[in-house]
């Protein structure tokens, strides 16, 4: 017998064709011989089956000898053998209805697990293969699990259910709730204004939550809460802000903070957490601040950086348009008795300048 696969909630059309290309009498029955529908002349008649309100046919096709059974809003329990009786013949069609759902919300926090559950009719032995938006394939039976969801897992998951050499495809939209960047680093000269941005990697119509930025200054022994805030839709409202530094926060998404000036005592690492309503767990973004200061004290020209720098970063002092006088993988460099002119302090990574501060050395008479 013919096998047709259907998807829960969808509509399926089971075909039944007579040899005569004209409207003749037909009946559709289920495996219990209960009449589903048929015709009486040009009228559609329905039987006492549980499909009554969801079953239909296409009268426009009857004259061509086609008598389809249309079942709307398919349910798993609609899986059955359906029999079309026409011209003293019986055509059997086995309908198997499958459902695939994410057993939790389809909006999941980065790092959480996604479980897809297959609903299938008794006696079936389907296999499932799912392809993630980043092209990763996972296979399984009744359940498929993906642990440690990543940002790239956001999007449409395409799952193929295979049964009796037939296949049916499901598409499930998954939204991974995360910040666009897990970590960022800001390089500033002392006194410059600092901007921290925390763009979200998703858009949700209604977004409610609360957040906090904790800061561990390099010079401090413990971390400190710099700001707490609430989020409602795109509206951001500050609840509490530390007096030093006096941060300012944008009143709408994307989350954005401004530090009036970069100072050595602020250099360090921060962790912005965002707890979303009706979600367990929090979103995190790390932010780092590196501050540079160039000073001249008597006969000593010094350049220093504070904050989380990697060991491969190079700190240099050079007179403008000349070779570096001093260059070290350290957080402070100096030149004694510097000659007059415009000196540059450079923080660089593999030749790329990350931060630069200029200081003018006047001639000594």
């Amino acid at each position: 017998k013919k096998v047709v696969l259907g998807k829960k909630g969808d509509t399926v059309e089971l075909t039944c064709t007579a040899s005569q290309k004209k409207s003749i009498q037909f009946h559709w029955k289920n495996s219990n011989q209960i009449k589903i529908l048929g015709n009486q002349g040009s009228f559609l008649t329905k039987g006492p089956s549980k499909l009554n309100d969801r079953a239909d046919s296409r009268r426009s096709l009857w004259d061509q000898g086609n008598f389809p059974l249309i079942i709307k809003n398919l349910k798993i329990e609609d899986s059955d053998t359906y029999i079309c009786e026409v011209e003293d013949q019986k055509e059997e069609v086995q309908l198997l209805v499958f459902g695939l759902t994410a057993n939790s919300d389809t909006h999941l926090l980065q790092g959480q697990s996604l479980t897809l559950t297959l609903e299938s009719p008794p006696g079936s032995s389907p296999s499932v293969q799912c392809r993630s938006p980043r092209g990763k394939n996972i296979q399984g039976g009744k359940t498929l699990s993906v642990s440690q969801l990543e940002l790239q897992d956001s999007g449409t998951w395409t799952c193929t259910v295979l049964q009796n050499q037939k296949k049916v495809e499901f598409k499930i939209d998954i939204v991974v709730l995360a910040f666009q960047k897990a970590s960022s680093i800001v390089y500033k000269k002392e006194g410059e204004q600092v901007e921290f941005s925390f763009p979200l990697a998703f858009t949700v119509e209604k977004l409610t939550g609360s957040g906090e930025l904790w800061w561990q200054a390099e010079r401090a022994s413990s971390s400190k809460s710099w700001i707490t805030f609430d989020l409602k839709n795109k509206e951001v409202s500050v609840k509490r802000v530390t007096q030093d530094p006096k941060l300012q926060m944008g009143k709408k998404l994307p989350l954005h903070l401004t530090l009036p000036q970069a100072l050595p005592q602020y250099a360090g690492s921060g962790n912005l957490t965002l707890a979303l309503e009706a979600k367990t767990g929090k979103l995190h973004q790390e932010v780092n601040l590196v501050v540079m200061r160039a000073t001249q004290l008597q006969k000593n020209l010094t350049c220093e950086v504070w904050g989380p720098t990697s060991p491969k970063l190079m700190l240099s002092l050079k007179l403008e348009n000349k070779e570096a006088k001093v260059s070290k993988r350290e957080k402070a460099v100096w030149v004694l008795n510097p000659e007059a002119g415009m000196w540059q302090c450079l923080l660089s990574d593999s030749g790329q300048v990350l931060l630069e501060s200029n200081i003018k050395v006047l001639p000594t008479w």
């Epitope: 204004q193 901007e195 609430d230 409602k232 839709n233 795109k234 509206e235 409202s237 300012q248 926060m249 944008g250 009143k251 709408k252 954005h256 401004t258 009036p260």
Partner: antibody
Framework: EVQLLESGGGLVQPGGSLRLSCSAS????????MSWVRQAPGKGLDWVSS????????YHADSVKGRFTISRDNSKNTLYLQMSSLRDEDTAVYYC???????????WGKGTTVTVSS | AIQMTQSPSSLSASVGDRVTITCRAS??????LGWYQQKPGKAPKFLIS???SLQSGVPSRFSGSGYGTDFTLTISSLQPEDFATYYC?????????FGQGTKVEIK
């Protein structure tokens, strides 16, 4: 059509009080931030106060803190500004304004005049 | 509070002229800046949001640009109905602050 209509302005003595109202129509009032902006004679625009429809949070300019209170009655689609301890420098046309979905003041009323004078 | 400095405070121009008004914020405000037009005795009219997004119904001769601290409103070819006072507004954070205004007068 979105409409805002201010009322309640008038002449008041220094130290006195006044309550301004702004009747809104043509949009879902409770969904939006509403604000008051004033303009002294011959001067520029001066933001006074805002209130969120979603959270009820209120924000005031330093010059009016402790003297003016913004409030709203979502069931009546009305915004209020309770002004007390009025000073000469509060003399202005007071405009009611509605924020759009991106939190910019997009629709303004015609204004109501408040004169503080002895 | 964030200060908004608008310049010039007034300018004289002729119909067909290209007019540029600048606005500077005392600190970075992303692109959270709006522009408004006001005619005598009338309420302000919203022209531009997010520094450069023209509101529906606003003629395309108006344009805005900028990010961070420096912003510009340009009228490419001044029309008689454009003679008015223009204000910038920082909408980054509370308190909201306006520039002091630029009056565009007929030369």
């Amino acid at each position: 059509e979105v409409q805002l209509l201010e009322s309640g302005g008038g002449l008041v003595q220094p130290g006195g009080s006044l309550r301004l109202s702004c009747s809104a129509s043509g949009f879902t009032f409770s969904d939006y931030v509403m604000s008051w902006v004033r303009q002294a004679p011959g001067k520029g625009l001066d933001w006074v106060s805002s209130i969120s429809g979603l959270t009820g949070n209120t924000y005031h300019a330093d010059s009016v803190k402790g003297r003016f209170t913004i409030s709203r009655d979502n069931s009546k689609n009305t915004l209020y500004l309770q002004m007390s301890s009025l000073r000469d420098e509060d003399t202005a046309v007071y405009y009611c304004a509605k924020d759009n979905e991106d939190y910019y003041m997009d629709v303004w009323g015609k204004g109501t005049t408040v004169t503080v004078s002895s | 509070a964030i200060q908004m400095t608008q310049s010039p405070s007034s300018l004289s121009a002729s119909v067909g002229d290209r007019v540029t008004i600048t606005c500077r914020a005392s600190q970075g405000i992303r692109n959270d800046l709006g522009w408004y037009q006001q005619k005598p005795g009338k309420a302000p009219k919203f022209l531009i949001s997010a520094a450069s997004s023209l509101q529906s119904g606003v003629p395309s001769r108006f344009s805005g640009s900028g990010y961070g601290t420096d912003f510009t409103l340009t009228i490419s070819s001044l029309q008689p109905e454009d003679f008015a006072t223009y204000y910038c507004l920082q909408d980054y954070t509370y308190p909201r602050t306006f520039g002091q205004g630029t009056k565009v007068e007929i030369k």
